[in-house]
């Protein structure tokens, strides 16, 4: 029967008896950074190509027996898992290995950095269609391997990492931190982050999404039609790479940026059970199990839209977290979270001509978050218009005035130390949904877009009493792309998007005080583009 | 030991065309900075990536390697040139005493230098 | 649940030879480094030796250099250390212990066996 | 194998905090992880504290570790009965290429 990892990974419509997706990933090719591999396996026999490429320390250890199973294991069963006869996940797709680790599974970032090069040279000498870099390996936070990463990934390279296996948070660890890579952790059968002994699966916002990675079946370097089961982000990195070869294989054109949304767009959501992370990473934690998409056409009409929440400000009393998008997709909106509930919200500002998410501490906070909510909008001219404080009563408010650009986002952001938790809150009067409001004390940001089709509408969940969180969705066909909180009063600790939610969530009831003080909106803006939609009408 | 033996050989004698000094100081007001592994056994002391701004040519990346062994030489250090960047990011891998740090990063076109470190499989 | 149970207590002349067990449960075997730790009565906890996962390395500390050998069987999960020419002063407690995690955290040890009484009497 | 240096004993009541310290040198400490284990009367050590400062699950967050230098410390805060055990740092040793472990630190919860 079908092992458990491929059928996770199968859309329902697809699942029976034999994995047999409908493109197995042939017209891309997989470069794998491992140890050395057992290329007359069965499994992976004809499908790869060991390279010249050797860049290894020497072992540890004062008495140390090579012996060519042993140094091969790791690789050989990563190569079984993206391209495998029997059990691989897109077996239609030709590989090439790298050796940049020992027989121990050691490595060096030096050795590393010269096998990237090494990909990018073969890339410009001999132009073949899309690639694939699987790295399912891990150091500590290196610039300069993050860097390499960076630059291979805007040369068009697709680079797929684990997150690592050390229970922490991926961002400590090198190629998981680098935001250009697609960074994998690991669940099991249950949909559980994965635990090895006492350490597990890596957490946190570098993570982009989890996929299998325990007791996964492939090759076995014993013997050539020998299989053996292993565990590890490695492993889930490797379905990532096999899904992202045939999704490649379907549509080759795919950008980096376009190949991540729909990762995130067709994973399972909310299935992993986050009480296994620390607290503090849950929120930053994408809940999400990587999956083939349900059909390898036609996703071109959806408007694609991820979270992207940046690091941790600090404490200082003027502090900031800066949230920044991938360079092919457009900032929609910003928001910002802070657990003690001291911020001065946030703000969309220009960087290096791209616009940036910013959030702001306040005095006596424990610091912010930013978080960016971006989108694949194409031919997408976006700017943001800013109303300063009002000092009226009825607070401040700012909307679109350009012909043909839609509110696709609102952000506030206050000088204040503390908005006044006595002041009413404002609620915006019916029948102008261009229109950002909010706090009298507070500046407005208003994120207009102009784009082919493009339509928004806003969606708000009020509750008048108390309530640590408040939610509004998008239903099907519209994408969440701007997510904020009326009032902007200080017990609300801040507002961010989960998927297609918007969720702004409130401090402890009981420290809340009175009902009124207590109300809450989750606003919502949701859009879709009818222009996406009639190409690929077209295309059909 | 033979080989390395045989590379200061090499460098004693290349050393009587590079001029002394900096002749090209780095740019006014850009300092280079150092980085290292958090997880110090993690590091590996005694090997750096010197990673030059992102213009810089094949040949600049040589020169300034050479520059570096000269210099180096001159204060009775060994060091190795283990290799050239180029396609990716410009700079070099270069074996030396953290005690030539401070020189190398006053080189010019040195952006920063990162101490190596282990990769582990996952 | 996850443990390591050791072979019975062993009372030995000196001189003589003994092989001490540790049989895993619960975990896979084979993806874990082992160490042995042994502890004298009323001393501290001494560090005999480490072997890698795959058995292909390994460590011993110098007193246990060229008389003890560590080994293992992965497929019987079993974990052993062979201990020659005994000295009284090698009566301990002897515990085995898992290795944390792959190479780069192979030096904690996160579960203990309930250790084996090892009394070297004449 | 020479071990790292720890105090023979400390003590307080229940509800303070105690630190035990560990010293050894730039092939141990100073450039390697430090594990912390506590070991009951008459049973096997267990892991409180690894790389520094990381608590396996199950561990309550009293128990916090540090590293100043070629110092760790390991600290018990909200002392509890339950605590009274015999405590050993670890670590690595890269001149040694051996673990070596402290020589132990007996805490007594007083009253």
């Known amino acids: 029967s079908i092992p458990w990892n491929l059928e996770r990974i199968t859309p329902p419509r697809y699942r029976a008896d034999e994995y047999q997706p409908p493109d197995g990933g042939s017209l891309v090719e997989v470069y794998l950074l491992d140890t050395s591999i057992q290329s007359d396996h069965r499994e992976i026999e004809g499908r790869v190509m060991v390279t010249d490429f050797e860049n290894v320390p020497e072992e540890d250890g004062t008495r140390f027996h090579r012996q060519a199973s042993k140094c091969d294991s790791h690789g050989t069963h990563l190569a079984g898992v993206v391209s495998g006869r029997d059990a691989g996940v897109a077996k239609g797709a030709s590989m090439r290995s790298l050796r940049v680790l020992n027989c121990q599974g050691k490595g060096t970032v030096s050795g590393t950095l010269i096998g990237l090069e090494f990909i990018r040279k073969s890339q410009l000498v001999q132009p073949v269609g899309p690639l694939v870099v699987l790295l399912p390996l891990a150091g500590g936070y290196s610039r300069v391997l993050n860097a390499a990463c960076q630059r291979l990934a805007r040369a068009g390279v697709v680079l797929v990492t684990a997150a690592g296996n050390f229970r922490d948070d991926a961002c400590l660890y090198s190629p998981a931190s680098a935001p250009e890579v697609i960074t994998v952790g690991a669940t099991n059968a249950q949909d559980q982050p994965v635990t090895l002994g006492t350490l597990g699966t890596n957490f946190g916002r570098c993570v982009d999404l989890f996929a299998p990675g325990e007791d996964i079946i492939g090759a076995s370097s014993h013997c050539s039609t020998c299989f053996v089961s292993q565990s590890g982000t490695s492993q889930a990195a490797a379905h990532v790479a096999g899904i992202a070869a045939m999704m490649l294989s379907a549509e080759p054109e795919l950008t980096l940026a376009e190949l991540r949304q729909r990762l995130i767009h067709f994973s399972a959501k909310d299935v992993i059970n986050e009480a296994w992370f620390p607290e503090d990473q849950r929120v930053l934690t994408p809940n999400l199990v990587a999956a083939l998409p349900p059909s390898t056409h036609g996703a071109g009409w959806q408007l694609f839209c991820r979270t992207v929440w940046s690091a941790h400000s600090g404490p200082t009393r003027m502090a900031t977290a800066v949230a920044r998008c991938a360079p092919d997709e457009e900032l929609l909106s910003c928001s910002s979270f802070s657990r003690s509930g001291k911020r001065r919200g946030e703000r969309m500002e220009a960087q290096g001509g791209k616009l940036v998410c910013r959030a702001h501490n306040a005095f006596g906070g424990e610091g912010v978050y930013a978080i960016a909510r971006c989108c694949l909008l194409p031919q997408a001219n976006c700017s943001v218009h800013t109303a300063p404080p009002a000092e009226a009563s009825m607070g401040t408010r700012v909307h679109c005035h350009q012909q043909g650009h839609v509110l696709t986002g609102c952000s506030s952001h206050w000088e204040v130390e503390d908005l006044g938790t006595h002041k009413p809150p404002v609620l915006r009067p019916r029948g102008q949904p261009n229109q950002c409001v909010g706090h009298r004390e507070a500046s407005i940001h208003a994120s207009c877009c102009h784009a082919p089709g493009l339509e928004c509408k806003v969606k708000e969940h009020g509750i008048p009493a108390p309530q640590e969180q408040v939610t509004v969705a998008c239903e099907e066909g519209w994408t969440l792309t701007g997510c904020s909180a009326l009032p902007g009063t200080s017990h609300v600790l801040g507002a961010y998007a989960v998927d297609n939610t918007c969720v702004v969530r409130s401090r402890d009831v009981s420290t809340t005080g009175s009902t009124s003080e207590g109300a809450v909106t989750a606003v919502a803006i949701c859009c879709r583009s009818r222009h996406l939609a009639q190409a690929s009408q077209e295309l059909q | 030991q033979e080989d390395e033996d045989g590379d200061y050989e090499e460098l004693v004698l290349a050393l009587r065309s590079e001029e002394d000094g900096l002749a090209e100081a780095p740019e006014h007001g850009t300092t280079a900075t150092f980085h290292r592994c958090a997880k110090d056994p993690w590091r590996l002391p005694g090997t750096y990536v010197v990673v030059l701004k992102e213009e810089t040519h094949l040949s600049q990346s040589e020169r300034t390697a050479r520059r570096l062994q000269a210099q180096a030489a001159r204060r009775g250090y060994l060091t190795k040139i283990l290799h050239v960047f180029h396609g990716l990011l410009p700079g070099f891998l270069v074996k030396m005493s953290g005690d030539l740090l401070e020189l190398a990063l006053k080189l010019p076109h040195v952006d920063y230098i990162e101490e190596d470190s282990s990769v582990f499989a996952q | 649940q996850v443990q390591l149970v050791q072979s019975g207590a062993e009372v030995k002349k000196p001189g003589s030879s003994v092989k001490v067990s540790c049989k895993a449960s619960a975990f896979t075997f084979d993806s874990f480094g082992m160490h042995w730790v042994r502890q004298a009565p009323g001393q501290g906890l001494e560090w005999m030796g480490l072997l890698w996962s795959d058995g292909s390395g390994e460590y011993y500390a110098d007193s246990a250099k060229g008389r003890f050998t560590i080994s293992r069987d992965n497929s019987k999960n079993t974990l052993y250390l062979q201990m020659n020419s005994l000295r009284s002063d090698d009566t301990a407690v002897y515990y085995c212990?898992?290795?944390?995690?792959?190479?780069?955290?192979?030096?904690?040890?996160?579960?203990w066996g309930q250790g084996t009484t090892v009394t070297v009497s004449s | 194998q020479s071990a790292l240096t720890q105090p023979p004993s400390v003590s307080g009541s229940p509800g303070q905090s105690v630190t035990i310290s560990c010293t050894g040198t730039s092939s141990n400490i100073g450039n390697q992880f430090v594990s912390w284990y506590q070991q009951l009367p008459g049973t096997a050590p267990k892991l409180m504290i690894y790389?520094?400062?990381k608590r396996p699950s199950g561990v309550p967050d009293r128990f916090s570790g540090s590293k100043s230098g070629n110092t760790a410390s390991l600290t018990i805060s909200g002392l509890q009965t339950g605590d009274e055990a015999d405590y050993y740092c670890?670590?690595?040793?890269?001149?040694?290429?051996?673990?070596?472990f402290g020589t132990g630190t007996r805490v007594t919860v007083l009253g």
């Open positions: 212990a898992r290795a944390m995690g792959a190479i780069y955290y192979y030096y904690a040890m996160d579960v």
């Open positions: 790389e520094y400062n």
């Open positions: 670890g670590s690595w040793d890269s001149s040694l290429s051996g673990y070596v």
